[in-house]
Each structure stands twice: as C-alpha cells, then as structure tokens.
C-alpha cells in the first residue's frame, strides 16, 4: 500500500532572466527512493539516480542545475518556461509518486512565491 505523500513548492512565480528552485519532498513512507525524474510536460529535464547520481538532459544542460538535494534549479528563465513541472519519485517497494509544480515566469518584478501544498 502506498502511504507516502509528496510536498512541493506548489504554484510559484519568478522573473524572466532569473532562477527558481523546484523542490519536492517525499514523506510518510519508508520506501527506498531509487530515482527521481524531473519532467516538464512530457520532456525529461533531469534524473537523479540513487546509485549513479545526477544526469541532466543535453537539451537543458545550460539552464538546469542539479539540487539542492533532490530538487532542480532552473536558470535564465524565459516566458516559455511557464507551465507544469513534475517530480516523479520511483520507490521500492511502493512504486511511483508524482508531485506537480506550476511555474509562471513574469516579465515584471512582481513575482512572488505561492503557498506550499500536498499531493497525496
């Protein structure tokens, strides 16, 4: 039975040209995390494998940095980066947990972080 929950940074906003940290945290389970994948829509951005470490997609290597922790840092943001991001936790023996973050990249300096929320 899957008992875990993923807490994410929720709906967030950031300024064009700036950076943002995408964070997810898996709790309430003793399952072993074997890999975390970060995806934007259906594009794979990065992988953090428990055995072999971080792998950044060649398409994003200039704008994506690993961490902190199992999170992901997006740099040199553009308006096109607006959209849904998913952290996909592959665990044993539970299976897969998915968290969702919505990022809005703003032209102006009025960007502010949204509230955290949980995905069961």
């Amino acid at each position: 039975m899957m008992t875990g929950t993923i807490e994410t940074t929720g709906n967030i906003s950031a300024e064009k040209g700036g950076s943002i940290i995408l964070q997810c945290h898996l709790s309430s389970t003793t399952a072993q995390v074997t890999q975390v994948n970060w995806e934007q829509q259906d594009q794979l951005l990065a992988i953090c494998n428990a055995d072999l470490g971080w792998h950044i997609s060649p398409s994003f290597k200039d704008r994506v940095a690993p961490g902190p922790g199992l999170g992901l840092t997006l740099q040199s943001l553009t308006v096109n980066d607006t959209g849904e991001y998913f952290c996909i936790y592959h665990t044993y023996p539970d299976g897969t947990y998915t968290g969702r973050i919505f990022l809005e990249v703003l032209e102006s300096s009025v960007a502010e972080h949204g509230a955290r929320f949980q995905i069961p």
Partner: antibody, heavy 121, light 108 residues
C-alpha cells in the same frame, strides 16, 4: 571500428562463480556506460546492471543484488561481470552492451557477441 | 519497475507486406524507448532510439513512433532478412532497465 569482445564460453557447477570479461575498442572507454544483459535459452532479454567505467559506480537489478559484481579496468578498457552462487537458472548467454554517455542516458548501440554460461552438475 | 508489454507475441506476415508491432509501458517513459532486432544465434541490434530515431545504418523501411506509454515499430515492406524477434526497451528508469517480452515476426 567500435566493438566489444567478450570472453569465451564457460561451464560451471552449481554454487560456483563465473567472471565474464568485455573488452571495448574504437571509442573513449570512460565516456560511455556499460550494461550487462542476459538471455536464457529461448527466453527474452533481462537487464542485470550498469557500470560507469570512468568512476566505477554501479547499479544492479534487485534480482541480482548480492550475487553480481561489475568492475572495470581502465588501463585495458575492459569491464567484468562476476556472478556468484550459480544455479541452473543462471544458464544463459551474457551480453555486455554500450549505453549512453555517462552524462545522460541512452539506448544500447553496441553489443558484445555474447558469452554462453552453462551451469550444470 | 516499469513493465514493458509487447503485442502480438507472434506476427505472421508475407514478404513485401507491412508489419506493425506495439509496445506499451506501465508508466510514461517520455520518448526514452528503443527497439532492437535479434536473429537466432546473434546479439541484439539497435534499430530505433528516442522512440523514432533510426540508428546508424538502419534502412528507412523501419520507423518508430509514439511517446509516453504507447509505441509502435513499423516495417513498411518486409524483406527476408527482417524475419526475427523484436524487443522494445525503456532506458529512463533504473534499476532495472526493462525490455518487453518480444515479438517474433515470422513468414506467413
């Protein structure tokens, strides 16, 4: 040209160990992951594990953890797969296969010729 | 682990006809899917990677499509040398990387 050459066929008794080698040539050995895949007679392909030849990090399928060890010798561009506590079900052809660059992931574009391992009393 | 399911298990096709092979992943693998061909007594050979990109030296009659969980390998006009077993594989989540059970393409 890029190629992987494996060691010859082996016959082992149950409980013994086997060590298969895979020598790479024609490319920069350290830059690509190496995988091991096996195929029992008349069966499909089964992934066993992966090694990063640059730094020696490994990841094994849970089924083989505790029984398999993958190592490499960068001076000879050779990877090794050792499987211990052999049983009859381990009778199979064992393949090494080159994966993607160690900075990302990739399909298996180059395969060794295979090594037949027979476990029989 | 991600389970890869191939269908059909066996496909009987006449030379010159089109063959369509299916592969389904139990969860999304984006486009990180490969197809391999294996003939008796030989090692597998990479045909398609990235779901739709032909590997070096692979004839244009082989094409791959799909993303997410549903994938297809199409052989537009089967040649005698194409009769073999075909495997799909996801290479995005490990351990373990996983293969489908294979589809045997045989002469009708």
């Amino acid at each position: 040209q890029v190629q992987l050459v494996q060691s010859g066929a082996e016959v082992k008794k149950p409980g013994a160990s086997v060590k298969v080698s895979c020598k790479a040539s024609g490319y920069t050995f350290r830059e690509y992951y190496m995988h091991w895949v096996r195929q029992a007679p008349g069966q499909g392909l089964e992934w066993m594990g992966i090694i990063n030849p640059s730094i020696g990090l490994t990841s094994y399928a849970r089924k083989f953890q505790g029984r398999v060890t993958m190592t490499r010798d960068t001076s000879t561009s050779t990877v090794y797969m050792e499987l211990s506590s052999l049983r009859s079900e381990d009778t199979a052809v064992y393949y090494c296969a080159r994966g993607g660059r160690t900075t990302w992931i990739g399909a298996f574009d180059i395969w060794g010729q295979g090594t037949m391992v027979t476990v029989s009393s | 682990e991600i389970v890869m399911t191939q269908s059909p298990a066996t496909l009987s096709v006449s030379p010159g006809e089109r063959a369509t092979l299916s592969c389904r992943a139990s969860q999304s693998v984006s486009s990180n899917l490969a197809w391999y061909q294996q003939k008796p007594g030989q090692a597998p050979r990479l045909l398609i990677y990235g779901a739709s990109t032909r590997a070096t030296g692979i004839p244009a009659r082989f094409s791959g499509s799909g993303s997410g969980t549903e994938f297809t390998l199409t052989i537009s006009s089967l040649q005698s040398e194409d009769f073999a077993v075909y495997y799909c594989q996801q290479y995005v989540v490990w351990p373990p990387l996983t293969f489908g059970g294979g589809t045997k393409v045989e002469i009708k």
